[in-house]
Amino acid sequence: YSHWPSCCPSKGYPSEELLRWSTVPVPPLKPASLDFHSVSCRASEDGPLNSRAISPWRYELDRDLNRLPQDLYHARCLCPHCVSLQTGSHMDPRGNSELLYHNQTVFYRRPCHGKKGNHKGYCLERRLYRVSLACVCVRPRVMG
Amino acid sequence: YSHWPSCCPSKGYPSEELLRWSTVPVPPLKPASLDFHSVSCRASEDGPLNSRAISPWRYELDRDLNRLPQDLYHARCLCPHCVSLQTGSHMDPRGNSELLYHNQTVFYRRPCHGKKGNHKGYCLERRLYRVSLACVCVRPRVMG
């Protein structure tokens, strides 16, 4: 389906070789900068959750054909502050719209090398990949 | 070590066999019911994002030793409505605290069978698994 010749090159290849673990998070393709659009900085009364939220966001595609899943989506906040529940448009400076991050497990296809060093298909390498999931309306942090 | 002879049974096995794709989402272990605790239905001024949110939530572990990732966390909303930005404790009925769902790609280990039907190690089966990521403060849906 995704035209990877074979995942494991030969019988007896250890599963650890297939799925090598790396705890170093891979940064997303683009920095997860805030993306404020005053025109779309409003909370809708219908539509999907991300547009009805008082901390609305949009999704940005991050595609990598050598990764599973190939498509990931990063949330981008549309407002710096939360939108008023009353009006759905005016911002309330008492609340901040903050990105919620998650280190998601992904797999990269890497060439697998046989005992003699020759190329033998592809292996999957497990990595942690930082994804922004949503924008959340929070009370600003009060420093002790 | 975990007695998987090899992940893929033999050279040339197609990756589709290793990573069979299923678009049927796997339901989480427990229904993602709301979990209201009046004692914890408040937005903190410090701590992690999920406790500072005006739609606070907690995380519940979902562990499956035959799945990658083995540990997933489901958000459970602590309040039915959003907490007031002003007080951090009183609820504002103009806003609902709603779960944000995501169909996450996961992999299950399954026995792989050789051409003659004999057991030949384990393969990874790709599935979609529904996870609740966070609770979001939204304006209630207005029905047209």
């Epitope: 599963s15 650890e16 799925l19 090598r20 673990w21 497990r126 | 070590y1 975990s2 007695h3 998987w4 992690p48 999920n50 406790s51 907690r58 995380y59 519940e60 572990l61 562990r63 030793l65 035959n66 990658l68 083995q70 540990d71 966390y73 280990r109």
Partner: antibody, heavy 125, light 107 residues
Framework: QVQLVQSGAEVKKPGASVKVSCKAS????????MNWVRQAPGQGLEWMGL????????SYKQKFQGRVTMTVDKSISTAYMELSRLRSDDTAVYYC??????????????????WGQGTLVTVSS | DIQMTQSPSSLSASVGDRVTITCQAS??????LNWYQQKPDGTIKLLIY???TLHTGVPSRFSGSGSGTDYTFTISSLQPEDIATYYC?????????FGQGTKLEIK
């Protein structure tokens, strides 16, 4: 070396709450899940639940759901277990236990590899 | 929840004896089984994880075996310091569950 040091014995009245602490040292506190296990007098071990100190994620035994709250304070590497609406049959020694994970990735095995010394909680009117 | 049935509940043996404790799960737990030792003073130690793997520093006289629903814990040659209560525990599925324990005494 890994050490888990628990708070001292407590005597509580029925209906009250108790909060037991478990201070961890000798390892990365946020890197390992913490379990809580109790043992009533003359009885076996009973698992109550666990908490991931990194994200506060929990899993509680159904029996304790709604009465138990597990929390952590990452700044002082301490886990807490609070049990409310105490009854006489909650009289027990309460243990915290670190959950180690073993084996090469990606599929781990889990075991409670280091235990606290236990905290006796007596519920009596 | 998965039920763990341990037997015997108590046993008496002499120093040097071979001691065997069994643990039966109410369903297949795929070797996801640990064994613990609780000394009379309440101290608890992990001995074996994943059915048969010895934890760091555990003497080789302790061993474990089994598969499916039936598991065995063995002390090949009983020593005086082995006086304790032994527990099996499954980690196949949450909630974790323990066997009732086997109290080991020396004759």
């Amino acid at each position: 070396q890994v050490q888990l040091v628990q708070s001292g014995a407590e005597v509580k009245k029925p209906g009250a709450s108790v909060k037991v602490s478990c201070k961890a040292s000798g390892y990365s506190f946020t890197g390992y899940t913490m379990n809580w296990v109790r043992q009533a007098p003359g009885q076996g071990l009973e698992w109550m639940g666990l908490i991931n100190p990194d994200n506060g994620g929990t899993s509680y035994k159904q029996k304790f759901q709604g009465r138990v709250t597990m929390t952590v304070d990452k700044s002082i590497s301490t886990a807490y277990m609070e049990l409310s609406r105490l009854r006489s049959d909650d009289t027990a020694v309460y243990y915290c236990a670190r959950e180690g994970y073993y084996g090469p990735s990606p599929f781990h095995h889990y075991a409670m590899d280091y235990w606290g010394q236990g905290t006796l909680v007596t519920v009596s009117s | 929840d998965i039920q763990m049935t341990q037997s015997p509940s108590s046993l008496s043996a002499s120093v040097g004896d071979r001691v065997t404790i069994t643990c039966q799960a109410s369903q297949d737990i795929s070797n996801y089984l640990n064994w613990y030792q609780q000394k009379p003073d309440g101290t608890i130690k992990l001995l074996i994880y994943y059915t048969s793997t010895l934890h760091t520093g555990v003497p080789s006289r302790f061993s474990g075996s089994g598969s499916g629903t039936d598991y065995t814990f063995t002390i090949s040659s009983l020593q005086p310091e082995d006086i304790a209560t032994y527990y099996c525990q499954q980690y196949s599925k949450l909630p974790y569950t323990f066997g009732q324990g086997t109290k080991l005494e020396i004759k």
